[in-house]
């Protein structure tokens, strides 16, 4: 196993419909044809994987169905997006990127990206 | 709250084996940085082995090198120390530890850490 550079913005602020939205970039050594991403998060002392996807290189990343992620892949870059997000899914989200196929597999783990999730006040009752 | 639960120590003769495990309870170890530690009576504790986040890299003190192996099974939610080739001066408790480190250093393993288990006795003794 290997190890290689990915890169990730530091912050991001969801917006108010719970969207976030941020670039994963990895530093590929080799033409890789396999790529699997994963999104993990860092909160309170524990990480839980957010969503994963494998992608052949050209082709569209596709996550599960029922998957709070969505991404679309150019080169060496990966342009995710995750739903769904409330005040208390804040944390650091991690991009985990890993080579899988041909050999040799590499493994590269961004330093996180801090989302902001605020939720948006309710409106207030109108009088008619 | 995530707690370290220690377990596999034992008499055993010199020359034996043993594998200690190192169980989370309350949570899991995924990434974390975990280490092993021992303490023999009237001596200071010193680190044995580590092993990263990641599980890429793994450290052993010179008087283990080759006897002692660290290895974990995110599945299992438990790391291991394997100890081959055990001699009188093994004789210890053993602690498990863990930290959960910044993602910039879940290859590497931790300076300090902040969860501490309860130990398991090794005594190697003919």
């Known amino acids: 196993c290997k190890a290689m550079h990915v890169a990730q913005p530091a912050v991001v602020l969801a917006s108010s419909r719970g969207i976030a939205s941020f670039v994963c970039e990895y530093a590929s050594p080799g033409k890789a044809t396999e790529v699997r991403v994963t999104v993990l998060r860092q909160a309170d002392s524990q990480v839980t994987e957010v969503c994963a996807a494998t992608y052949m290189m050209g082709n569209e990343l596709t996550f599960l169905d029922d998957s709070i992620c969505t991404g679309t892949s150019s080169g060496n870059q990966v342009n995710l997006t995750i739903q769904g997000l409330r005040a208390m899914d804040t944390g650091l989200y991690i991009c985990k990127v890993e080579l899988m196929y041909p050999p040799p597999y590499y493994l590269g783990i961004g330093n996180g990206t801090q989302i902001y999730v605020i939720d948006p006040e309710p409106c207030p009752d109108s009088d008619f | 709250e995530v707690q370290l639960v220690e377990s596999g120590g034992g008499l055993v003769q010199p020359g034996g084996s043993l594998r200690l495990s190192c169980e989370a309870s309350g949570g899991t170890l995924d990434y974390w940085s975990i280490g092993w530690f021992r303490q023999a009576p009237g001596k200071e504790r010193e680190e044995v082995s580590c092993?990263?986040?990641?599980?890429?890299?793994?450290n052993y003190a010179d008087s283990v090198k080759g006897r002692f192996t660290i290895s974990r099974d995110n599945s299992k939610n438990t790391v291991y120390l394997q100890m081959n080739s055990l001699r009188a001066e093994d004789t210890a408790v053993y602690y498990c530890?863990?930290?959960?480190?910044?993602?910039?250093?879940?290859?590497?393993?931790?300076?300090?850490?902040?969860?501490w288990g309860q130990g398991t006795q090794v005594t190697v003794s003919s």
């Open positions: 530890t863990g930290k959960l480190l910044h993602p910039s250093l879940w290859s590497a393993c931790a300076n300090e850490y902040d969860l």
């Open positions: 092993i990263s986040g990641t599980g890429l890299r793994t």
